[in-house]
């Protein structure tokens, strides 16, 4: 089976305050089985932004139907962006288990927030 790659094609994304930000993430294999999670920041203090298996995440929606078994697009849209949302976002594949364990991370996408156009 093909080795899983996690592709975050955009190194950076710039969005005006109040708009929505789309953060792209695709995977190249359905294996290993397990959820995709999005985090802001790296290391122990990273913050969970989206998890397929829990929620709700009121400002986060998936761009495609992640519930479909063959889905490989785990891009998300974050609505009503504010300057406090700036940071680096990571798309991470977990291997199913008790608990799920981190398998592989995307390279990250840095979100910057522009002032609201007047």
């Amino acid at each position: 089976e093909e080795e899983l790659q996690i592709i975050q094609p955009d190194k950076s994304v710039s969005v005006a305050a109040g708009e929505s930000a789309i953060l792209h993430c695709t995977i190249t294999s359905l294996f290993p089985v397990g959820p995709i999670q999005w985090f802001r920041g790296a290391g122990p203090a990273r913050v969970l932004i989206y998890n397929q298996r829990q929620g709700p995440f009121p400002r986060v929606t998936t761009v495609s139907e992640t519930t479909k078994r063959e889905n490989m697009d785990f891009s998300i849209s974050i609505s009503n962006i504010t300057p406090a949302d700036a940071g680096t976002y990571y798309c991470i594949k977990f291997r199913k288990g008790s608990p799920d364990t981190e398998f592989k991370s995307g390279a990250g996408t840095e979100l910057s927030v522009r002032a609201k156009p007047s």
Partner: antibody
Framework: DVQLVESGGGLVRPGESLRLSCAAS????????VTWVRQAPGEGLEWVSL???????YYADSVKGRFTISRDNSKSTLYLQMNSLRAEDTAVYYC???????????WGLGTLVTVSS | EIVLTQSPGTLSVSPGERATFSCRAS??????LAWYQQKPGQAPRLLIY???TRATGIPARFSGSGSGTEFTLTISSLQSEDFAVYYC??????????FGGGTKVEIK
Amino acid sequence: DVQLVESGGGLVRPGESLRLSCAASGFTFTNYAVTWVRQAPGEGLEWVSLISVTGTTYYADSVKGRFTISRDNSKSTLYLQMNSLRAEDTAVYYCAKVTWKNVFDYWGLGTLVTVSS
Amino acid sequence: EIVLTQSPGTLSVSPGERATFSCRASQTVGSKLAWYQQKPGQAPRLLIYDANTRATGIPARFSGSGSGTEFTLTISSLQSEDFAVYYCQQHTDWPPYTFGGGTKVEIK
């Protein structure tokens, strides 16, 4: 409003155990790392332990092997199990919410642990 | 482990005056330095992170500067509520997260 409320402190003898709790509200507990920081009487702040959103745990060398941090996401509660307590563990223990920047933006009022014979 | 040294230990200042105190790291922390304020009997309060970014709700009279190993917290005009102990903390990505020993700002 974010609120963190510690409980479980008290007076114990050296070698005994104690379990601290921290009840969190006002934020999505499951999404954030949380931490314990302590302050001995008249002294400065000392980081004790942290648990990440995925449950990975980290400890200061001074408590490694004696203290265990855990979280119950269904109850939005953080715990610190303290075993083999020593006089030098006497302190006010604070729990705090951790931002993705690794800083502690909200703190509880603390609970006092006194270890004395 | 990164050791943070704060100076002076105590600073005596009159209300309305400017207060400046420092934090020195034993090795570079880039801009990953935070400042907290603690009043007697209270929990610490986050003031500054990333060396110079004010936390939510912190007045503009508080400002941070520095990078690498040398950092400064300045209170431009001390108010009565600013008399407290101030701690620095390095917030690089991985534990242990260390604090300085504190600077007590007292009324002159």
